[in-house]
């Protein structure tokens, strides 16, 4: 997480800055959405604990044709140490229920805000 360049600045981005920028992007998505986010697409919900960033990316990367979350997908890839492609699910990603992308983003945002307040940037 020491090299998250490309989101807002050309050089390495501190983890706290990267997390804040991800939170800001999710806030932007939730506030600016007039129609259902990604027009009703449903994704696998995730366990918001260990491996959360990769799990979130694994879930969202399956959604195509939704420009509203493309930046989020790119930002999450900076937090995940391995390359993630569509259809890939790690052992941490238990597929037990699907939710709308809008709800997924809201849940993720609430959790990331909590982590930020607690100073957990990694």
């Amino acid at each position: 997480l020491t090299c998250l360049g490309g989101f807002a600045s050309p050089g390495p981005v501190p983890p706290s800055t990267a997390l804040r920028e991800l939170i800001e992007e999710l806030v932007n998505i939730t506030q600016n959405q007039k129609a259902p986010l990604c027009n009703g697409s449903m994704v696998w919900s995730i366990n918001l604990t260990a491996g959360m960033y990769c799990a979130a990316l694994e879930s969202l990367i399956n959604v195509s044709g939704c420009s509203a979350i493309e930046k989020t997908q790119r930002m999450l890839s900076g937090f995940c140490p391995h390359k993630v492609s569509a259809g890939q699910f790690s052992s941490l990603h238990v597929r037990d229920t699907k939710i709308e992308v809008a709800q997924f983003v809201k849940d993720l945002l609430l959790h990331l805000k909590k982590l930020f307040r607690e100073g957990q940037f990694n």
Epitope: N39, N62, C66
Partner: nanobody, 116 residues
């Protein structure tokens, strides 16, 4: 053009059974995970079940586990949902959907009403 056409809905008594079908066209059906999603009157969308492209792995919402069975026939480009032990709370419009896709890739839905 992607088309999904559901059928098999209707009125059934509590404890009864129905089998929903979804005929797919306009895409390579066997390449895609598929979903059943439902919407009860005045409620939001609720995911019901998913099946992987091969039909090997299936997933169910807790509310239907043990009562509903999802399956597919890739040779017929058709998705199925066998619904047993139906309850009043299963009353909804049932949609079949190409997984992870927008409403554009959903069917028009079939109404299932469970009532005595």
């Amino acid at each position: 053009e992607v088309q999904l056409l559901e059928s098999g809905g209707g009125l059934v008594q509590p404890g009864g059974s129905l089998r929903l079908s979804c005929a797919a066209s306009g895409f390579t059906f066997s390449d895609y995970e598929m979903d059943w999603v439902r919407q009860a009157p005045g409620k939001g969308l609720e995911w019901v079940s998913s099946i992987d492209n091969s039909g090997f792995s299936t997933y169910y919402a807790d509310s239907v586990k043990g009562r509903f069975t999802i399956s597919r026939d890739n040779s017929k480009n058709t998705l199925y949902l066998q619904m047993n032990s139906l309850r009043a709370e299963d009353t909804a419009v049932y949609y079949c959907a190409k997984a992870f896709s927008t409403f554009d890739y959903w069917g028009q839905g079939t109404l299932v009403t469970v009532s005595s």
